[in-house]
């Protein structure tokens, strides 16, 4: 659907009005944003400024090494991940801008607000092939030492990016631009109409797929990874803990709010009020959910400068060092290179 | 009291335009819409477009190309414009308002104005 | 744009009696602020359309209260409990949630 020319105030002050007066004008414009748009706006400019830049340098500093360090391949695809989400901030910061007027077509519609759920997939399944990993260098060393390699973690990245992108077609096909007549607005949504039990479906699916079964299983998996590096004494395994304790809360504590609101709202009939309500804290839910995509970089920093003690080299040397290191960690009388024990535990929440 | 009162040709050659007023007393064209909606002969109503307060206008899409409405604030007209009539587009065109646009449909209707689109 | 089915085509009644009236968007009518735009029109012979309904069942003024309207998201219905001799002519439903506003092909009132 082509773009629609024309700019678009907010009359949204007149959305419950009830009695008519003739002096006062029925469709001019009120420019105030509501509260949970301005505290969007503010966390959207700050993913992307944090997001573009600290993913644009982990891609960086990890292309180089991606031929021959594992480690480098799962950190650059999180980070390609959370970089193609970010590029579409501006779009959707401007259409907030707009009182969420969407002047920017039907194919822009369908693809940059599927992106965030992209990312959402594409990252908690490459977290999942990197617990996998993790959890096979610690119980089955001999068999990485034989099978572990480059070419492997390539193509259990490419299913990792398929399966997201099959995830995601759902919310791309339902996705339409509604012109609503007055007050004059270009909408961007879903629009399931006649089906609620399609859109039932596809909200379980996406907190099933994306947050659930994620939780659950990545608990189990670390759960097990870190009992078994106390029980070795294995070498830094507080330092171990710690980050894959921040990069699991991530994910999850900030993809919370948008699946708490999506499941109720898809249970919940369009004109309740609890369904106004929750429609209004939307942009807020999807601006949170959205910090996983800026989230990565800080926590490689930060705990890059824990490992060194404090900041004494450059951010690329320091990223290098944590996102491609592929240390050695004792397991079953033989000696492999692991990632368990890495500070790059973040690959673990999105 | 609110009215729209329409006047205009009731018979236009092929390819040539049409043109009506709607005069509307009881509110004021600064501060409320009014849209134009159609009706041909035993056929359902067809909206052609509407004016808002601040000037805005926005077209059916079927008939964009086709269409024009202004207005006079001061002289509280409304004008809809239609070029290259054919015989199809013969009905009775109508001016109508909501007012209060946020709650209601088409509250308030002109009587109409019979257009016979014939050689 | 935004279909709107009407069922019956045509409705004959006796006087006194019920009359119920259905209509169906291609599309769900709930508009962002909440309200769903769904009018209910009635146009006798050589007149202009009346505002019978507005947003889905309220009354619009000087309209008695044997006309109701109810329904939700994309399924509407309008019913004359007692139906008299000056309720006879063409019922239209409307939507004006999306642009452009569409109205339904009408069900013709008519004495049985």
């Known amino acids: 659907m082509d773009s629609f020319n024309y700019t678009t105030p907010d009359y949204g002050h007149y959305d419950d009005k009830d009695t008519l007066d003739l002096n006062t004008p029925v469709d001019k414009t009120s420019n105030t944003l509501r509260v949970p748009d301005i505290l969007a706006l503010v966390i959207f400019a700050v993913v992307f400024l944090v997001g573009v830049l600290g993913n644009a340098l982990v891609v960086w500093v990890t292309a180089f090494e991606a031929k021959r360090t594992i480690n480098a391949i799962w950190f650059l695809n999180l980070a390609v991940a959370d970089f193609l989400s970010c590029l579409a901030l501006p779009i959707l910061f401007t259409s907030i801008v707009q009182h969420h007027h969407w002047p920017f077509g039907g194919a822009a519609c369908s693809i940059l607000p599927s992106l965030i759920l992209l990312n959402m997939y594409a990252s908690i399944l490459l977290l999942a092939t990197i617990s996998a990993d993790r959890f096979l260098l610690v119980f089955k060393p001999i068999w990485c030492q034989n099978f572990r390699g480059a070419g492997l973690a390539w193509i259990a990245c490419a299913v990792a990016w398929g399966l997201a992108l099959l995830l995601t077609i759902p919310s791309f096909l339902y996705r339409v631009v509604r012109e609503e007549y007055f007050p004059p607005k270009v909408l961007c949504g879903v629009d399931y109409s006649h089906d609620k039990r399609r859109e039932r479906a596809v909200a379980i699916v996406r907190l099933v797929l994306g947050f659930l079964w994620p939780l659950l299983t990545l608990t189990i998996c670390y759960t097990f990874i870190l009992l078994r590096t106390w029980s070795r004494r294995a070498t830094r395994s507080t330092k171990t803990l710690k980050v894959v304790v921040a990069v699991v809360a991530s994910f999850f504590i900030f993809w919370l709010p948008y699946q708490v609101t999506g499941i109720m709202m898809s249970f919940l009939e369009p004109s309740s009020p609890t369904f106004l309500l929750l429609k209004k804290l939307d942009s807020l839910c999807v601006s949170f959910a959205y910090i996983n995509c800026c989230i990565n970089p800080i926590i490689y920093v930060v705990a890059g400068q824990g490992f060194q003690g404090r900041l004494r080299k450059s951010l690329p040397s320091l990223l290098r060092n944590v996102l491609t290191e592929e240390s050695v960690v004792r397991e079953s009388k033989s000696f492999t290179r692991s990632t368990v024990d890495t500070m790059a535990q973040k690959t673990q929440a999105v | 009291q609110v009215q729209l009162k329409q006047s205009g040709p009731g018979l236009v050659a092929p390819s040539q335009s049409l043109s009506i007023t709607c005069t509307v007393s009881?509110?004021?064209?600064?501060?409320?819409?009014v849209d134009w909606v159609r009706q041909s002969p035993g056929k359902s109503l067809e909206w052609l477009g509407v004016?808002?307060?601040?000037?805005?206008?926005k077209y059916n899409s079927a008939l964009k190309s086709r269409l024009s409405i202004s207005k006079d604030n001061s002289k509280s007209q409304v004008f809809l414009k239609v070029n290259s009539l054919q015989t199809d587009d013969t009905a009775v065109y109508y001016c109508a308002s909501a007012l209060d646009y946020s709650n209601y449909g088409f509250a308030y209707w002109g009587q109409g104005t019979l257009v016979t689109v014939s050689a | 744009d935004v279909v709107m089915t009407q069922t019956p085509l045509s409705l004959p009644v006796s006087l006194g009696n019920q009359a119920s009236i259905s209509c169906r968007s291609s599309?769900?009518?709930?508009?962002?602020?909440?309200?769903?735009?769904l009018h209910w029109y009635l146009q006798k012979p050589g007149q202009s359309p009346r505002l019978l309904i507005y947003k889905v069942f309220n009354r619009f003024s000087g309209v008695p209260d044997r006309f109701s309207g109810s329904g939700s998201g994309t399924d509407f219905t309008l019913k004359i409990s007692r139906v008299e001799a000056e309720d006879l002519g063409v019922y239209f439903c409307a939507q004006s949630t999306l642009v452009p506003p569409t109205f339904g092909g009408g069900t013709k009132l008519e004495i049985k």
């Open positions: 599309q769900s009518l709930v508009h962002s602020n909440g309200n769903t735009y």
């Open positions: 004016i808002w307060g601040d000037g805005l206008t």
């Open positions: 009881g509110f004021s064209l600064t501060n409320c819409g």
